[in-house]
């Protein structure tokens, strides 16, 4: 079919012309005010210079106004996340105006062409905002642009072109290809709004990164490190999502940003927290669970303005589905080794016992390697709120059956046949809750029995000499 777009980003119906000389020219971008929670309702179309629809459709000039901006599309239809997000916004902000920016004709093209159209779409949104600003009581500060994928960069352009400063832009996994490393005026950046928060859910350091890896907002949140999202593995996808292909894995991870945002709207009582950290590896090590100096924040809609920060990278773990909230714990474990433990890393698990619930057997992920005669830090997380921690059980699983480990065990045995056992001595474990910021120290029940070997377990209880607890919590944590 002929490309229905003129050079000015306007739409020409070339498919059917009743008269040879007549060409119908329409705006290429439509603004649909969603006037009902019913996704089937056609809503109201707004256009610059036409005030009647604003009155007819009860546009609330003093309320918050959300603009939802979709991204590139292969099918040319609105995907199902859209009506979920519209509904969630209506639920959370009952008086708000929710406007869907329909740029499907300009997005339903080759990706490179869609990218080249983002600027003109941003201009259209800016024109709409400039016109609305002419109305009494309308404030740009009440405007929140929410852009998914390519739509995040459209929001950036809109924020850049508008007269004044929009209140907030949320980038939901902003697109990576053709934007990674781009100049700040050619992508979403902190300059585009008073507050720019970003969720990154599909970043890859190898292969094609569908989502942008670099930080582009005031705060940039990388759930699960910003790459492999729980529930989006090929096995999960085959069972639960239509089609069950690699394409669906990509869609699942990329779209997870939208669902995390929806979750933050509808599950207010279960807010997820993210923690500032220089990189994903340090976060996985459990080093970054501090809320001091605004180092933690709510994610999604509930994120607190952090205009003093720019490109602040924050991390968290999540569940595989809504509600996504998990409870993070930092474990500081001082390990002594009196017997040579060889090259193999111990496979350690911890079970936390709390006043509300007990955790599952949680693996202590060894990001690099365990340092002996040193304090090792680990990150563990639970899906349920355990309450106050009462005790914990450390388990050392028997040797993992990899050829590498078996060979190492055999080699260790040959080098020291009289003492093949491996032992770690752990006297205490210090635990810090990310969500409450409380610190508790746990000791072995019997100080003389603080060694653990493969296949054994070691119990820890609150230390008798008074367990440490810091009540200095962050202002965000008090909202939990």
């Amino acid at each position: 079919s002929p490309v229905p777009f003129g050079p000015e980003g306007r739409l020409e119906d070339k498919l059917h012309k009743p008269k040879a000389t007549q060409t119908e020219v329409k705006p290429s971008v439509r603004f649909n005010l969603r006037t009902s929670k019913d996704p089937e309702h056609e809503g109201c179309y707004l256009s610059v210079g036409h005030s009647q629809p604003l009155e007819d459709c009860s546009f609330n000039m003093t309320a918050k106004t959300f603009f939802i901006i979709h991204g590139w599309t292969m099918s040319g239809i609105f995907e199902n996340w859209l009506h979920k997000l519209v509904s969630a916004l209506h639920t959370r902000e009952k008086d708000a105006n929710v406007v869907v920016v329909d740029w499907l004709p300009l997005a339903h093209q080759l990706y490179t062409d869609a990218v080249n159209n983002t600027r003109v779409v941003g201009h259209s949104i800016a024109r709409m905002l400039d016109w609305l600003q002419e109305k009494d009581d309308f404030s740009l500060g009440n405007v929140h642009l929410i852009g998914y994928s390519l739509g995040a960069h459209v929001a950036g352009y809109a924020g850049n072109f508008v007269k004044g400063t929009v209140g907030r832009i949320t980038g939901l996994d902003p697109a990576g290809p053709m934007f990674e490393g781009a100049d700040i005026h050619k992508r979403l950046s902190p300059d585009d709004a008073d507050f720019v928060d970003v969720l990154h859910t599909y970043t890859r350091s190898f292969g094609l990164s569908i989502g942008i890896q670099m930080p582009v907002g005031h705060i940039d949140i990388y759930p699960n490190g910003g790459d492999f999202q729980p529930g989006c593995g090929l096995n999960d996808v085959l069972g639960s999502i239509a089609y069950g292909t690699i394409t669906e894995v990509v869609k699942c991870e990329h779209e997870r940003a939208v669902h995390l945002f929806v979750d933050s709207l509808v599950n207010q009582d279960k807010p997820s927290f993210a923690f500032q950290c220089t990189d994903s590896n340090r976060f996985k090590k459990g080093i970054c669970l501090s809320c001091r100096k605004n180092r933690c924040n709510n994610i999604g809609y509930n994120a607190k303005k952090m205009r003093k920060k720019r490109n602040s990278k924050m991390y968290l773990k999540t569940r595989a589905g809504m509600p996504f909230k998990v409870y993070h714990y930092q474990l500081k474990v001082h390990m002594f080794s009196y017997n040579n433990s060889g090259d193999t890393q111990p496979t350690l698990y911890i079970t936390l016992y709390g006043s509300n619930a007990d955790s599952q057997n949680l693996p202590l992920e060894i990001v690099e390697k365990i340092e002996l005669n040193a304090t090792n830090t680990f990150l563990v997380y639970t899906e349920e709120d355990l309450g106050d921690l009462l005790k914990m059980r450390l388990t050392w699983e028997g040797v993992a059956h990899s050829w590498y480990n078996l060979w190492n065990e055999f080699r260790n045995y040959l080098s020291q046949p009289s003492n093949p056992s491996r032992e770690l001595y752990i006297r205490r474990i210090r635990v810090k809750s990310g969500e409450t910021q409380r610190k508790v120290t746990f000791c072995t029940q019997d100080p003389t029995k603080s060694s653990i070997s493969p296949g054994q377990e070691l119990w820890f209880h609150k230390c008798q000499d008074g367990w440490k607890m810091k009540n200095k919590t962050s202002p965000f944590v008090n909202l939990a």
């Epitope: 290429s28 649909n32 309702h41 292969m74 199902n80 519209v86 339903h108």
Partner: antibody
């Protein structure tokens, strides 16, 4: 009330061209997508594709790429299905059906159908 | 493409009794808690009419004796109590957000 009214039955010879119309009323034509569905005699329903009634951009199912063309006359709130180089296997009833852009993509209103017979 | 398999191909039900029609999808049609499965009724010489959308929601003006259930890959249309006017062919239809959209093979319902 909402109505989709299709053009009357057609009798064509193989190799000819047919153009079926679907006129919408009772709603804003450009605010809903338009599907085309084929039903061969005694057979089940087969989705042919859809057209964005605002932009005019068509999307075709794999089996309907090539000889089939969707178009619009927006000013007349009318969608068209054109089939070129007709074959005997095109004998069927063709339905237009609308769906909401913003919703769950089900087909809430259908045209009455246009019966096409292709025979030499 | 998602293949929808309906069973039985035909059934005969006595007036006032329950009719149950099954539709099995080759892959899940669920998305974030919703099922994108719809049901239509078609009488001879007429276009299909929407009965149920999103697995269990009743279409506009459809009597409450029609109900839909299911999730993932397995869906059911129930009609109870069956009335004379329910004699028709019933089709399931999936509308996930990646066309092509597909229909089941149809189930012909006769009233005994």
């Amino acid at each position: 009330q909402i109505q989709l009214v299709q053009s009357g039955p057609e009798l064509k010879k193989p190799g000819e061209t047919v153009k079926i119309s679907c006129k919408a009323s009772g709603y804003t034509f450009t605010n809903y997508g338009m599907n085309w569905v084929k039903q061969a005699p005694g057979k089940d329903l087969k989705w042919m594709g859809w057209i964005n009634t605002y932009s005019g951009v068509p999307t075709y199912a794999d089996d309907f790429k090539g000889r089939f063309a969707f178009s619009l006359e927006t000013s007349a709130s009318t969608a068209y299905l054109q089939i070129n180089n007709l074959k005997n296997e095109d004998t069927a009833t063709y339905f237009c059906a609308r769906f909401s852009y913003y919703g769950r993509h089900y087909f809430d209103y259908w045209g009455q159908g246009t019966t096409l017979t292709v025979s030499s | 493409d998602i293949v929808l398999t309906q069973s039985p191909a035909s059934l005969a039900v006595s007036l006032g009794q329950r009719a149950t029609i099954s539709c099995k999808a080759s892959q899940s049609v669920d998305y974030d808690g919703d099922s994108y499965m719809n049901w239509y009724q078609q009488k001879p010489g007429q276009p299909p009419q929407l009965l149920i959308y999103a697995a269990s929601n009743l279409g506009s003006g459809i009597p409450a004796r029609f109900s839909g259930s299911g999730s993932g890959t397995d869906f059911t249309l129930n009609i109870h109590p069956v009335e004379e006017e329910d004699a028709a062919t019933y089709y399931c239809h999936q509308s996930t957000d990646d066309p092509p959209w597909t229909f089941g093979g149809g189930t012909k319902l006769e009233i005994k």
